[in-house]
Every structure is written in structure tokens, then in C-alpha cells.
Interface confidence: low
Amino acid sequence: EEELQMIQPEKLLLVTVGKTATLHCTVTSLLPVGPVLWFRGVGPGRELIYNQKEGHFPRVTTVSDLTKRNNMDFSIRISSITPADVGTYYCVKFRKGSPDDVEFKSGPGTEMALGAKPSAPVVLGPAARTTPEHTVSFTCESHGFSPRDITLKWFKNGNELSDFQTNVDPTGQSVAYSIRSTARVVLDPWDVRSQVICEVAHVTLQGDPLRGTANLSEAIRVPPTLEVTQQPMRVGNQVNVTCQVRKFYPQSLQLTWSENGNVCQRETASTLTENKDGTYNWTSWFLVNISDQRDDVVLTCQVKHDGQLAVSKRLALEVTVHQKDQSSDATP
């Protein structure tokens, strides 16, 4: 039979007021015969918390059934934790003896301290949208945690960020603490579908960090590129001109066609095509009547995107004699 070891795996146990605390203790041997007791503190003044053999302990329950012959788990649960319960708890094996049982071996002890979980991190982005290549700031806040030690990380699409500043308040002793971090993120043109994540790790979370997220789609504006093209074929007396608005975000877009400076058609973008990167494309068609047109017609496609200054693209219409004379649906 191997020598008895009393195993208390946790050095520190953080508990919350009003909750139940589980103090773990396992033994490596059933020998020697005798009970296991729990104490808070050491020495003559130690407080008996639980006695396997006898006594009434209304707030204490055992994790395993200690009446079972080969039980090796002497863990206990203490309910309705109060601040008065903090201290170091020892699991102690006694050897059956006369007139009293004799202390045989003690566990290393588990310190019980009050802990509080951090609140779910809240990530806030910039108030206004910004175009790619610019830097935007995101803030992350979490509150109400204890002890003070906490780890905060930032990620963009799974890649850890390094440009951030973090503060934990207050700096002195407190019942609970708060953390605030600001990360600077350079926007890329493909960031419509990107996400920033604030990850908070704390001892009370048992290795399962809390995460707050923000979508860069809320922070980015990708301005459109314009291309105005005259279609080669005529439709009756009309020439078809297209304005291709490409790679823009968000969707909000108004388009105006002008002919030699005179506004002739206004449109609001609808039935957009979505690109893989989350940006949008849209094409507007404009029919120009060329039956009595001069050769110096200038068409302008003007786009106002997301309330920004309008951008425009011009096209000098090329109407050849052949086009004037021959309709695309004419038969040879």
C-alpha cells in the first residue's frame, strides 16, 4: 500500500458572497483507518469545519458519499458564503485511536478568498465612419471584478493587436475593480467583414475568458470607384451609357446623371451586388437621345455616398455618322 498523500489541488479558491464554495481534497490511500476532518486555520485555535465521523454541520455537504468503503474524495461544499468564511482550510486525516483519534497527515491547505467575475466586456467603436488606411480607436470596458489581476487582449480577425493602452482602476485596495482599454486599429479596404475582439481573462473565469466584439462594418466607409462607359450599339435613336459604381460601403448612395451640366436623372441605389469582401457594386444605365444631337455632348455621373462630398466621372459622348444613320436593330 502506498503512503497516504492528502491532495488539496487549489492553493487559492475565489468565491462569491452568497454562493457555494467547493473545497477539494482527495487521498491516495484508504489506510490508515480513521476519519477525515476539515479545519480552518492551524494550531490549537483552529476551527472545526467538518468531521466525517460525527457532529452537525448544516452549511457543509460532502461531494462524495463518505460512507462508501473505497471513497477517496473528501471534498466538501460550504453554502451561503459570507466574508467571515475567508481563511485557509485544511483537510486532515486522523488515525483511529484511543482515547482520541490521532492526527496522521494534513493537506497543504486551500486559501479561500472573495472573488468577483468581470462583467461581459463592452466594445465601443468610433462615432463616425472612417476610410481605409486611417486609424480608428476602439474602447473596451469591464467592471466589478476581484482580485485586481486581470489580462486583456485585443484581436482583429483572430490576429492579436499590440497598439493599445489599458488601465485598471482603482490603483489601491478595493472590493471590485474596473478595466478600460483603448486599441488603435488601421482600417484595410477589406475590413467590412472584419471584427475586433476584446478578450478578458480573470482567475474567477476558470480559464474561459470573456469576449466583447465590434464589427468594423460600423466604423468603415469604403468610397466607391466610378467608371462611365458608352455602349457600342445604338438602340433606335438612343445610345446606352452606364455608370459602374464599384466597391463601396455602406449601401447608402445617390446618383445623378447630367447632360452638358443639366441634371436629367436622379437615382437611389437599389438591387446592389455584394462582393466577397462585403462591399457593394451598382450599375446605372442612362439612355441618350442622339437623333438631333451635336457631337460635343458631355455626360456626368455624380455619386453622393453615405452623405459625403459627391464624386463624379465625365464622358464625352462619341456619336459617329454611322451611329446617327444606322440603328442597331436595322436590317442590312
Epitope: 500500500e1 502506498e2 458519499d65 460512507t67 468503503r69 473505497n70 471513497n71
Partner: antibody, heavy 118, light 107 residues
Amino acid sequence: EVQLVESGGGLVQPGGSLRLSCAASGFTLSSYDMHWVRQAPGKGLEWVSAIGTAGDTYYTGSVKGRFTISRENAKNSLYLQMNSLRAADTAVYYCVRGGVWDDAFDIWGQGTMVTVSS
Amino acid sequence: DIQMTQSPSSLSASVGDRVTITCRASQGINNYAAWFQQKPGKAPKSLIYTASSLHSGVPSKFSGSGSGTDFTLTISSLQPEDFATYYCQQYVSYPYTFGQGTKLEIK
């Protein structure tokens, strides 16, 4: 389904040897204390031997030094090597699983008959 | 070794009867007493452990009680399938030992 199936019984002469096997299915044999219990014809039950999860072994007085209990975790099997057999060892031998916490017998095999006779 | 003494050795009863079998340990065994049922030509079946806990699948007409040295098995309303031999066992220390058995027969 949790099951124990014994094999290896048969007729053997006094002084001879037999090896009983018990194949476990539906659970990991090494996680439990395992036992052999026997029943002579027309008689009651008699505990024979046990092997603990740590490999510790126990025997009833009449078989000490003659019987050896063992297990092979890879095959999920329990064995009882019986040497120097006597007529008094004639019995049905049962393989039994002990409970997780208190070693109370919960699962029994169907048994295998061992007859020691010249 | 701890001796387990069962009584009676045999018992005749009728369908519907309530019967009690007792078992006495030669020394205190806490509550580490178990009960088994065995029918002719079959392996024993586990009924009760730690004196009063029923194994899964065992009907509630079976009940056990006791601690220390004296234990009882009670069958509240006998059915034809309950006529068999019943054994008690101590498993507090090796060697584990069984009672000599109680044969329950139809009257």
C-alpha cells in the same frame, strides 16, 4: 451494454491447473475493483479473490498461494490462474464487478464450471 | 473473518405475502451489507447495497434496512418470480463473506 463473460472452465485432475478468463464489455475494467466468486454444487456463494484499481490483490484463505488474479487492460479482461487444484475447488466461478465507490457487487457474469476430479 | 448468519435457512410463503429475511454479522460492518437473489441454474442478481440502496432496475417491493450487525431484507408482496434463494453479504473488509442463503419456496 455492460456485460461480463467467463470462459476457461472444464474438467481437470487434482493437482492440475486452469486459467479462467472474464471478458468485459460496455465499461473499462481497470476502473473498477473486480472479483471472482464461486459456488460449489448445491452450496452457497463464496468470495474467492479481488483485484483493486491500483492492482492490489486479495484472496480467501483456502486459495492463497495457489490462485492468482490478474487483468489485462488492453484486452479489458480479468483472469484467475488456478494451480494445485483440489476437489474442493469444484464450483461454478463467477466474475463480478465491484461498484465505483463502495465496491458493492453490481454486475455478475453467467459463470463457468470447473470440475476437479480424477 | 466476519461471519454472516442468515435466518431462516428456508421459508415457505404464498403469493401476496410480505416476507422478511434477517442477517447478522459477527462484528459491526457499518452499513456495508448487500443482498442477492439467485434462481436455480442462474447467476446471482444484485438487489441491495449499503444495507438499503436498491440497484438500478430492482423493483421497489424489495427493501433493506439495518446497520452495525443486524440487517433485514423485506419483500412486500411476493410474486411467483420472487421464489428463489437469497444471500446476504458483508463487504466492509476482506475476505468478503456471504450468508449461507435463505431458500424462499411457494407454500
